[in-house]
Amino acid sequence: HNTTVFQGVAGQSLQVSCPYDSMKHWGRRKAWCRQLGEKGPCQRVVSTHNLWLLSFLRRWNGSTAITDDTLGGTLTITLRNLQPHDAGLYQCQSLHGSEADTLRKVLVEVLADPLDHRDAGDLWFPGESESFEDAHVEHSISRSLLEGEIPFPPTS
């Protein structure tokens, strides 16, 4: 699995999307987990409703929410009030009994709020030991662009 990078601004919300084949994963609950180290386990943060039919209902664990469009095949995770410690490697998972299939590997990067004039050194990225040369960047900054600002260029 390649790693997809989602960037969000500290203090704001970040929405992560994980597309999947809806028929392949029919009937399977989904989960969002945080990777503990490069080869460590993936610690469950939040999972969809216990009843698969109700997967569209948003479930929260602290500031993290999950909802699943089981027909369209898109799992959406919302990280509210993004904080420096939220930066890191995560996975979207499809659950089947005790099995967990990885739908997408996600690297969350937390950017300093440009409107926040605190210490300019407050940029939060995962440790340099992690290599994501093939990572695909999804810019998911949730605030509206200010007049005159240039939005991030689209990525392929």
């Epitope: 028929m23 392949k24 029919w26 009937g27 399977r28 698969w52 039919l53």
Partner: antibody, heavy 122, light 107 residues
Framework: QVQLQQSGAELARPGASVKLSCKAS????????IQWVKQRPGQGLEWIGT????????RYTQKFKGKATLTADKSSSTTYMQLNSLASEDSAVYYC???????????????WGQGTSVTVSS | DIQMTQSPASLSVSVGETVTITCRAS??????LAWYQQKQGRSPQLLVY???NLADGVPSRFSGSGSGTQYSLKINSLQSEDFGYYYC?????????FGGGTKVEIK
Amino acid sequence: QVQLQQSGAELARPGASVKLSCKASGYTFTSYWIQWVKQRPGQGLEWIGTIYPGDGDARYTQKFKGKATLTADKSSSTTYMQLNSLASEDSAVYYCARNGITTAGYYAMDYWGQGTSVTVSS
Amino acid sequence: DIQMTQSPASLSVSVGETVTITCRASENIYSNLAWYQQKQGRSPQLLVYAATNLADGVPSRFSGSGSGTQYSLKINSLQSEDFGYYYCQHFWGTPYTFGGGTKVEIK
């Protein structure tokens, strides 16, 4: 109507390989997992593995890892199971079956092929 | 892997009697269970899915019940065409193992 048509009986020598086929019709081939099941004479059903033709993702029970290889050809809506290093205990009827789904998200094998008999003999 | 223990292995019954076959899973399978009937020399046929739901065309004398680790298939007023083999199968993660089967024969 949904149909799974399996290939004809096989007679093989010990140590040889055979490739069984299961041709699907009457539904969207790439959207349903296909299961393979073994049944030795006078014995019960034994689950071998499953493949999702949409992307070729295959899962096997531990016993059949290395023994069975599942593949799928989208262009012909056909799933294949190759059995290698054949031995007498591989003599059995092999079934393919579609993994049906329900609106509530449950699975069951709703359509079965007629079975292919494999006899391993020197 | 989840083990499915099916009982009895065989039973002899008369037409019109009621039969109950049970299946025990080695862990909770959350009703992800199917029952099949197989006649000699034929492919299995789906009877029950999701533990309690009858497949299309299955007579109402068949019924499935259970939850957690314990499941059963009941056949009321057994008919001559009901004789054969019955298997349970779980779908709570691969491998989708079967029970050992139950042979229902005429007394």
